[in-house]
Interface confidence: low
């Protein structure tokens, strides 16, 4: 028998520094978790102590904090190199700054293989990117070899900016020939490492012949055996065992997100490369694990540039940006309009000539807007200003919802109107009219939404049975502020970009902004 220890991370999203328990900014260091310095301590302890160790990342290192905004992926390459990762799969967010924003800072700088078997380059990009990422890699581990084959969500063109010269194929179709190739090379221990979400991970385990272990990401899935050590509720046992179509027991793992846990999976193989046993658990990287002093010193050195950046001007406003609770929790506010416009702009993807864009709608809980920005400071807007407006470190995500779910959400928005509660929705690509004289649950009298399958966008009545794409804060996607119907009824959920980053990018692009209150939200006469 031969033992392999797989250490794995996924969806780290730029959490290079330690964070609070909810993965936002660390406030009380004695209660903080994660970060690359602490991760390094644990990884080194395990490497020193166990003979055959692989450290793998299943994608989405990019995007999530000011670290990515400023360093644009150079920080990912630098610190992953320092931690001596053995391999990484490409996630959808690795394409957020386009293909160039992946090639230059990461692909060319990484000292470890970066993998995806289902991304095929074409046209002039094919020669430029050749060899910079691979479908698979054979890694020597002790006196054995292990094959790692990568995969990436085929939805990436809708979620990020990979451009037109990368084709995202079906994961299972693309993986099988690469696994077959590994078998012909006498590699009999194969890990599928990728970023397509837990449901696809399970399908790969079931359908791809020859895959022994699946290490996944994208869905931020937390698996645990026994009593979980923090707030995350397990979606199943760790590892999650899938019976493949050819009768093998295939362990599937994921390690939540944000570098809060280090996935720890021990696999025992027989001499033919069959998995005899698999077991483990994610390790909570809490303050009982010290931060490595040398990595911490490096983090502090890199931090200096971030502090300078946060006070630099991103753009200007020539109007007062009303983010007050007196406005945003009661009526349409121009800060809400600005944020929603930025959210839609961040999701412009011309992937189909029948559609001007794949998504036109935004909703945003008014309670998530925490501060106004005064234009009388020379109009200057800084990252620091935006951090006061959006202090929670959330993401703006893409969901698919039925029209009937959206209708319920808008009824919830005003079900207890007038009490300055956070659920009042700000919008983009939506015109809503409320009649507050009607009873709660029946106050939405008009709900029109901007078409997507049209050359000239216009507003049409919401159809209850139609499926719509909507951009919204992850807080709402997870049922926050009482929007349980969104959590329970959503048909798809893909996590998006850091909220502040979305708005800052938009402001930088526009240079000068002047959002207005323009009749997106109305109250029918006599009721308000």
């Amino acid at each position: 028998a031969w033992e392999l220890t797989i250490l794995h991370t996924n969806d780290v999203h730029s959490r290079l520094e330690q964070t609070s328990e909810d993965s936002s900014k660390c406030v009380n260091a004695s209660r903080c978790m994660g970060g690359v310095a602490r991760l390094f301590t644990k990884v080194q302890q395990i490497r020193r102590a166990e003979p055959n160790v692989l450290l793998l990342d299943a994608g989405d290192q990019y995007q999530g904090t000011i670290w990515f905004t400023v360093y644009k992926g150079a920080e990912v390459a630098h610190f992953m190199n320092a931690l001596r990762y053995d391999a990484m799969a490409l996630g959808n967010h690795e394409f957020d700054n386009g293909v160039e924003g992946l090639i230059e800072p990461l692909l060319k700088e990484a000292k470890f293989p970066i993998l995806s078997a289902n991304i095929k380059a074409k046209g002039p990009l094919a020669s430029q990117i050749s060899g910079l990422y691979l479908p698979y890699k054979v890694l020597p581990v002790g006196d054995e070899v292990v094959g790692i084959v990568g995969y990436t969500s085929k939805e990436t063109p809708f979620l990020s900016n990979p451009g037109t010269n990368l084709v995202f194929e079906d994961e299972i179709t693309a993986l099988q020939p690469e696994v077959d190739k590994l078998k012909t090379l006498n590699v009999n221990k194969i890990i599928a490492l990728g970023h397509s979400g837990f449901e696809m991970d399970k399908l790969i385990a079931q359908k791809v012949r020859g895959v022994d272990v699946v290490v996944g990401g994208h869905s931020n899935t937390f698996l645990y055996t026994g009593n979980p050590p923090s707030k995350e509720v397990p979606a199943g046992k760790y590892p999650f065992i899938v019976t493949s179509d050819d009768g093998r027991k295939v362990p599937v793992v994921q390690a939540y997100a944000f570098g809060k846990y280090l996935g720890y999976l021990k696999i025992e193989f027989d001499e033919r490369g069959n998995v005899i046993s698999s077991h483990g658990n994610p390790i909570l990287l809490n303050s009982s694990i010290p931060e490595d002093p040398s990595i911490k010193a490096d983090i502090n050195k890199w931090r200096i540039k971030l502090d300078n950046y946060s006070t630099q001007e991103l753009g200007k406003t020539i109007v007062y940006l009303d983010g007050s609770s007196q406005s945003c929790r009661f009526r349409e506010c121009n800060m809400g309009n600005l944020i929603c416009d930025a959210m839609i702009n961040n999701n412009l993807r011309h992937t189909d000539e029948m559609f001007w864009n794949h998504v036109s709608m935004c909703i945003l809980n008014g309670g998530g807007i925490r501060s106004p920005i005064d234009e009388r400071n020379n109009g200057t807007i800084t990252w620091e200003n935006l951090a006061a407006v959006l202090p929670f470190g959330g993401t703006f995500d893409l969901v698919q919802l039925k029209g009937s779910t959206l209708k319920k959400a808008f009824e919830h928005s005003v079900h207890r109107y007038g009490q300055s509660t956070g659920e009042f929705l700000q919008v983009g690509g939506i015109h809503v009219v409320y009649d507050l004289s009607r009873k709660p649950g029946d106050r939405v009298v008009k709900l029109d939404v901007l078409c997507t399958k049209c050359r000239v966008p216009s507003y049409d009545p919401l159809k209850m049975d139609e499926v719509y794409k909507v951009i919204l804060p992850n807080f709402l996607a997870n049922g926050g502020d009482g929007f349980q119907m969104i959590k329970d009824e959503l048909l798809r959920h893909d996590s998006g970009d850091q909220d502040i980053n979305v708005v800052s990018t938009y402001i930088s692009k526009m240079k000068v902004i002047y959002p207005a209150v323009e009749g997106r939200i109305k109250f029918s006469t006599g009721s308000h």
Epitope: E3, Q45, R48, A49, G226, H279, N281, I283
Partner: antibody, heavy 119, light 107 residues
């Protein structure tokens, strides 16, 4: 402080079985391995096998595969080793010891249970 | 199975002495070696893991070294409480195997 609690002694008849316990309070039981080690009087240490409390996955020394069966009860944070078809060769002190993430050093040991096989 | 050999089964030394206990493996074990101390009352403690890393709470007079197949444990300044039997153990491959032990006595 991690303490593994084992009963002091067991007296059993030849041919019978005995189930030894190892109670492990004071830490997340399901995140670690429990190892079992045999020591015959005046002899050295011999690794019998181990069990991962989180999933009941186990490894055995081939020599003990038909002799020992390892189990856990997570509700009571207790590991068990059943020894079957006992002979005088099985008279020994049996230790349980914890190992876990990041080092397979047996970091914490029980006091050991002395098993005497005698008619 | 990997055989672990401690050629010296017993060793006599004086208080304050520097004592070295050796251990060899039947094949290379890439530093995957631990040292344990067993007191006369049967109590067992981990002293050193991964050849040279001191387990928490273990006095700094204990140190370990070695590579490949040959390893050693050194006690730099022998104290009365160090009277015990010392075992090496490899964890490079299953099954885990121990050396036969070296019993340390006071002259």
């Amino acid at each position: 402080q991690v303490q593994l609690q084992q009963p002091g002694a067991e007296l059993v008849k030849p041919g019978a079985s005995v189930k030894l316990s190892c109670k492990a309070p004071g830490y997340t039981f399901t995140s670690y391995w429990i190892n079992w080690v045999k020591q015959r009087p005046g002899q050295g240490l011999e690794w019998i096998g181990n069990i991962y409390a989180g999933s009941s996955s186990s490894n055995y020394n081939e020599k003990f595969k038909s002799k020992a069966t390892l189990t856990v009860d997570t509700s009571s944070s207790t590991a068990y080793m059943q020894l079957s078809s006992l002979t005088s060769d099985d008279s020994a002190v049996y230790y349980c010891a914890r190992s876990g993430h990041g080092y397979d050093g047996f970091a914490y040991w029980g006091q050991g249970t002395l098993v005497t096989v005698s008619a | 199975d990997i055989q672990m050999t401690q050629t010296t089964s017993s060793l006599s030394a004086s208080l304050g002495d520097r004592v070295t206990i050796s251990c060899s493996a039947s094949q290379g074990i890439s530093n995957y070696l631990n040292w344990y101390q067993q007191k006369p009352d049967g109590t067992v403690k981990l002293l050193i893991y991964y050849t040279s890393s001191l387990h928490s709470g273990v006095p700094s007079r204990f140190s370990g070294s070695g590579s490949g197949t040959d390893y050693s444990l050194t006690i730099s300044n022998l104290e009365p409480e160090d009277i015990a039997t010392y075992y090496c153990q490899q964890y490079s491959k299953l099954p885990r195997t121990f050396g036969g032990g070296t019993k340390l006595e006071i002259k």
